[in-house]
Interface confidence: medium
């Protein structure tokens, strides 16, 4: 499919001008290559009319120009003094005319309306309001006032001052007679339809002395604004329909076959399933304007979108509307990243988030999409060191690996963490990506105690058991804080006995805290990584208390509270992969400290988007 995009149809009137914008992916090659506008012949081929290399056909001499805007990835063709001969099929493109890097444009130039003398022209957008003013003389002040529409050869009464209203205009028309000082009546038509366009005649009086005024009403279907966005990127539709519909339900719909327009989202709470997790309808301002953000753009999102206002929350005849034609460029600068990440209850996920590498100093954010009402995405963590209170100790945003990617780690997973999350920065708003976290059946791979109590002035040793599948990974311990997780020295204690059917490649790596102080209290993570790419993590909370009896502590798995959704058996046994195993160190006298922390706020359900781009979390 060609990545060039422009308007499919351009309509104008003889004598007028048009401006046609064509979009292309702004690669360095494309920015500098030839741009052209050509007319398609009946037998194929495409005859150049104007190009960026200075060529202008004699047909366009003195009335056309082509301007390239390489920084935007657009070029614009302006054509003036249009005639009906200019109607036809054209292409705007890059390179050689026959190469296929082009977009088909249909230009239709119609004859201007043949208007009677003294005709007032009203040009109004579809769905809006028109006021037709009709002057009259004093002698007709008390006589009947009326408005007719010319249908074929005959005038048809639309409204009059005796109370008649044509059924086609019921509920959306009124006739106002100004105060005695002004010799004027006006007809106001709301929610204009395309069928309202035409010639009108207003009249005061019915005899030969009546006053008449001709009006030509042109109802404009909104020209769609062209929007060119990258696959996997994001688009924002800004919809400003005016204060007169500030209190009317708003909608965004996508045109399907014919005149159907399927609701994508509306302010009445409707949202199309295909946009679950990746759409927000932002609140209206007092003037009735609103915006819709869609992330994770897919090929199938391309098409014509309309925003509008109607009490039903969907497109109806007479709805005021705005239109966009969205083109999704498959030659995307936004790299592929997993759209689904899987983790197990009690385990962890590490999510890779792409950003525009030109903006390495931008603030990075991670937020949780919530579908309630019109959708919102409250922030959970940012790269400035803010972490939402309920996520302290289990969420971290790391600038690594850098160069266009940052990492978010979330551990101590529960079923409530299932949902959609957005990666974004305060820089390029097009780089908003969505990832769905799914919680699947399974056990966490890393085994750590639950909460641990250390004694002031003593030594604490905390174990982390790594199964053999992580034999080639770097293993680490770190202390969590709101800006990241600071690495700590750890000791490899040899093979772990915590895994069934696991050979000598399993590992027990311990964190040792010597001469414990109050400052040692907090969250500690053990984890695996390969270079700057992070894998699974497990978290332990270390509490610090006053000395009761001398000695050092060697904490074992039995001191753990159960990870969420996991059972701890009596007599110091922990059930791992449905097989109870016994560790010789499980019988230390220390009791576990209860963990009552808030794992996450709110309850969320997972929605399976059926994506094939999946990344494993704690288990496959």
């Amino acid at each position: 499919k060609s990545p060039i995009f422009g308007p499919e149809e351009v309509n104008s009137v003889e004598g007028n001008s048009v401006s046609i914008t064509c979009y292309y992916p702004p690669t360095s090659v494309n920015r500098h290559t030839r741009k052209y506008w050509c007319r398609q012949g009946a037998r194929g081929g495409c005859i150049t009319l104007i190009s960026s290399e200075g060529y202008v056909s004699s047909k366009y001499a003195g009335r056309a120009n082509l301007t390239n805007f390489p920084e935007n990835g657009t070029f614009v063709v302006n054509i003036a003094q249009l005639s009906q001969d200019d109607s036809g099929r054209y292409k705007c493109g890059l390179g050689i005319n026959s190469r296929g890097l082009s977009f088909d444009v249909s230009l239709e130039v119609s004859q201007g309306p043949g208007l009677l003398n003294d005709t007032k022209v009203y040009t109004v957008d579809l769905g809006r309001t028109v006021t037709i003013n009709c002057p009259f003389k004093t002698e007709n002040a008390q006589k009947r006032k009326s408005l007719y529409k010319q249908i074929g050869l005959y005038p048809v009464l639309v409204i009059d001052s005796s109370g008649y209203v044509n059924p086609n205009y019921t509920g959306r028309i009124r006739l106002d007679i100004q105060g005695t000082g002004q010799l004027l009546f006006s007809v106001v038509i709301n929610q204009l339809r395309l069928s309202d366009a035409g010639q009108y005649l207003c009249q005061a009086g019915d005899d030969s002395n009546s006053n008449k005024k001709n009006a030509d009403l042109q109802v404009l279907k909104p020209e769609p604004e062209l929007v060119y966005e990258d696959l996997r990127g994001s688009v924002t539709f800004h919809c400003a329909l005016g204060p007169e519909v500030a209190n009317v339900a708003k909608f965004l719909c996508r045109q399907s076959s014919g005149e159907n327009c399927d609701v994508v989202v509306n302010t009445l709470g409707k949202r199309a399933p295909a946009f679950e997790g990746r759409i927000l309808l932002n609140p209206q301002d007092k003037d009735g304007s609103f915006s819709v953000v869609i992330t994770g753009l897919r090929k199938e999102d391309a098409g014509r979108y309309l925003c509008g206002a109607h009490s039903d929350g969907q497109l109806q005849e007479g709805s005021p509307i705005q239109a966009w034609q969205l083109f999704v460029n498959e030659e995307s600068t936004i790299p592929r990243s997993p759209t689904v990440v899987k983790g197990v209850a009690g385990g962890s996920v590490a999510v890779l988030c792409p950003y525009n590498r030109k903006e390495s100093k931008s603030i990075k954010y991670w937020c949780l999409w919530e579908g309630a009402q019109n959708g919102r995405c409250p922030l959970l963590v940012d790269s400035e060191g803010w972490v939402k209170a309920q996520y302290e100790g289990r969420l971290s945003l790391l600038e690594e690996p850098g160069n266009g990617t940052f990492t978010v780690i979330l551990n101590q997973l529960t079923s409530r963490d299932a949902g959609f999350y957005w990666c974004l920065t305060n820089g390029d708003t097009l780089w908003r990506t969505t990832v769905e976290i799914k919680i699947i059946e399974g056990e966490p791979n890393l085994k750590v105690p639950g909460n641990v109590t250390a004694v002031l002035g003593e030594t604490l040793k905390v174990p982390c058991h790594f199964p053999c599948k992580f034999s080639s990974y770097e293993k680490y311990w770190c202390k969590w804080n709101n800006t990241g997780c600071q690495a700590l020295p750890s000791q490899d204690e040899g093979p772990s006995k915590a895994f069934v059917n696991c050979d000598e490649n399993s590992r027990l790596v311990s964190l040792t805290l010597n001469l414990v102080t109050r400052a040692d209290e907090g969250w500690y993570w053990c984890g695996v990584k390969q270079g700057h790419f992070y894998g699974e993590t497990a978290a332990v909370y270390v509490a610090v208390e006053e000395r009761k009896a001398a000695g050092s502590r060697d904490v074992s798995l039995a001191k753990a509270d159960a990870a969420p959704d996991e059972k701890v058996l009596d007599s110091g046994f922990r059930e791992i992969e449905n097989k109870a195993i016994q560790d010789p160190r499980l019988f230390a006298e220390e009791k576990a400290v209860a963990d009552t922390r808030d794992q996450a706020d709110g309850s969320r359900a997972s929605v399976d988007s059926g994506s094939s781009e999946e990344q494993g979390g704690s288990s496959r």
């Epitope: 924002t236 927000l280 932002n282 609140p283 915006s291 953000v293 954010y365 937020c367 919530e370 009402q373 019109n374 959708g375 919102r376 995405c377 409250p378 922030l379 940012d382 400035e384 060191g385 803010w386 972490v387 939402k388 209170a389 309920q390 974004l424 305060n426 708003t429 709101n482």
Partner: nanobody
Framework: EVQLVESGGGLVQAGGSLRLSCAAS????????MGWFRQAPGKEREFVAD????????YYADSVKGRFTISRDNAKNTVYLQMNSLKPEDTAVYYC???????????????????????WGQGTLVTVSS
Amino acid sequence: EVQLVESGGGLVQAGGSLRLSCAASGRTFRSYAMGWFRQAPGKEREFVADISWRGGRLYYADSVKGRFTISRDNAKNTVYLQMNSLKPEDTAVYYCAATGDQPAFTTAQGMGAMLEYDYWGQGTLVTVSS
């Protein structure tokens, strides 16, 4: 749990200035975004300004832009609202509020509806006479 206490309200001439303070108790103050709201007699409560946890991101209602300034001092657990060029229509009870969410982010990033504030003060009355 965060408790909020506003002070600094009072009677002032049109064109004058006032500085409202909101003292918060609770060790997690620094991780909360703070906002000021106001409610004029017989009207709904309306948003005035909010500030992110570190004070780097600010957001103002159009009606107060350029006249009011929100700031915070995390060491003192206090958020301020400096009100200059006061007008009679600024007369209202001013409330301080705190949220564990980050509304300055939400609004600036187009991330959805104004967020729910978890904690509210009792309010302080500001009267601007003409």
